[in-house]
Amino acid sequence: DTHKSEVAHRFKDLGEEHFKGLVLVAFSQYLQQCPFEEHVKLVNEVTEFAKTCVADESAENCDKSLHTLFGDKLCTVATLRETYGEMADCCAKQEPERNECFLQHKDDNPNLPPLVRPEVDVMCTAFHDNEATFLKKYLYEVARRHPYFYAPELLFFAARYKAAFAECCQAADKAACLLPKLDELRDEGKASSAKQRLKCASLQKFGDRAFKAWAVARLSQKFPKAEFAEVSKLVTDLTKVHTECCHGDLLECADDRADLAKYMCENQDSISSKLKECCDKPLLEKSHCLAEVENDEMPADLPSLAADYVESKDVCKNYAEAKDVFLGMFLYEYARRHPDYSVMLLLRLAKAYEATLEKCCAAADPHECYAKVFDEFQPLVEEPQNLVKQNCELFEQLGEYKFQNALLVRYTKKVPQVSTPTLVEVSRNLGKVGAKCCKLPEAKRMPCAEDYLSVVLNRLCVLHEKTPVSEKVTKCCTESLVNRRPCFSALELDEAYVPKAFNAETFTFHADMCTLSEKEKQVKKQTALVELVKHKPKATKEQLKGVMDNFAAFVEKCCKADDKEACFAEEGPKFVAASQAALA
């Protein structure tokens, strides 16, 4: 299905609004430091050019690839060398190396100021004055901070952002209407970004076989009534969509995602009974809805797996004939029977089954060798079950903030070389698993918890890859995607770590602490906690709990004082001295 002009093809398929939005996202994800106005100018130039190609596909340069067109446009930025340093060297390369070079320079932790939310009236005025610019600014600000955000999904977020302002700026109490909606979009957006980052890491670090295995497991859980061939087709199409988006091919990605949604809605009967309400929605909403759709009910009469995968004398013959297809069918059959398992557990079971067949099919009596293969699954299943049970027990005992603190201590002891901001960010997010998953019924706890932890730990891996400091983190992140979480769980105290020297400045606090929001206060205290553990890695949990209780009391006392700064100046050194004595 070749087109004379790729850019004209995508413009016509997507329409001008989506085309412009996606090009803005693409440019913002590549050049994360460029000012908004610069990107808008580039997008307008590309859009005008696309329109000339729509009018005449044979016009000059219309036959060029999108990478060539976009790369050439990015390389016209005058301040490339000053702003991006060695990324400017990408422009000396030819496609496809140039695009690969741009991709490698995407920064998962760009040095950008946190987004400050203006007053509601200020935002509503900006929205009414120039709605188009207001929404473009949203796309730009999110995309540059989240360079792997799933672009077609970001268009959906922008549509919801627009709807929130359109509704709430008319409301009697604008703030009461708008702020909860913006909070929800922010939280959902961060979660969406992190989930997509894991998909891209899976594709880029472990290859499309790893992603396809993940997709087979997840889609088989969602669509247990679908045939294996149907699931395989969806997996192939989904892999193409995510490969494109992760590779910066956002127009192709959005176009193919729309095609996939169309296909699913035209073939609901052979996929799932749960798709109906999604398929009545407009495109962006429909695609989002299909991606988030709940698991269909399992067919009632599914036979035992043992017959085909353990008891049959043809197991080795079937495996040898088409290894990946046979393993794919095993994964499909196991996953559709187990919506109560995490995807990562299902992938571990498939890996264990593969390892057993590799060993046994070369043995003298293969059947005797693999006869007990399902028994070997039991410890693999119990490990995440125990993890979830224990951590939910602790969460229920402590509440979210103190549960996060327990995780901060745990992970700082495991990998004390990791930077304090990273440990705080990752542990706070790990701690959110409690509120998210522990309230769910037993059958939903493990898939919720373990698959969420995989997303959060991927963030640790991505940040650590940028600035590697711990061999243990590198090992857990790179050896096996499916065993990342068990690898981190199994890490013990780092005995080789030399405790960080005490620095009074780290534990000096001022009256500005009192004006911080509750979240910012928590982060301050948690930062101090990490530093404390880095200083005293062998401190017991009881000792650390005592210090943190004293810290909370000290801050509360000084924030109630008439002369807050004087109180911090006087009580701070006493608190530090008492803490050092308690941890001696």
Partner: nanobody, 124 residues
Framework: QVQLVESGGGLVQPGGSLRLSCAAS????????MGWFRQPPGKEREFVAS????????YYADSVKGRFTISRDNAKNTGYLQMSSLKPEDTAVYYC?????????????????WGRGTQVTVSS
């Protein structure tokens, strides 16, 4: 502080049994989870079994499942590890540990207090 003292170790033949005890003093034992760890000669310390504070959740290493049973008597401030069908690879110093979370974690660093250990040797 919690003080822990292990007892019950010794020399036993393969297939034999032993019962280890862990006597606790100093704090309210029932607020702590208890774990047993072991250190085979020339190897790292490893998790064996744990029991939460109330005694209703128990956890075992795969290598001992079905052979060892952990239990506790909060009234006596004592924990136990019943070991049966012992194998030569069970030879190690066995340590009792207390976890202030009350959960019974698998990682040794989660435990605040440790006993000095008791030697178990399985040999014919």
């Amino acid at each position: 502080q919690v003080q822990l003292v292990e007892s019950g170790g010794g020399l036993v033949q393969p297939g034999g049994s032993l019962r280890l005890s862990c006597a606790a003093s100093g704090r309210i034992f029932s607020t702590y989870a208890m774990g047993w760890f072991r250190q085979p000669p020339g190897k790292e310390r490893e998790f064996v079994a744990s029991i939460n504070r109330s005694g209703d959740s128990t956890y075992y290493a795969d290598s001992v499942k079905g052979r060892f049973t952990i239990s506790r008597d909060n009234a006596k401030n004592t924990g136990y590890l019943q070991m049966s069908s012992l194998k030569p690879e069970d030879t190690a110093v066995y340590y009792c540990a207390a976890d202030s979370d009350g959960i019974g974690w698998f990682n040794s660093f989660e435990y605040d207090y440790w006993g000095r250990g008791t030697q178990v040797t399985v040999s014919s």
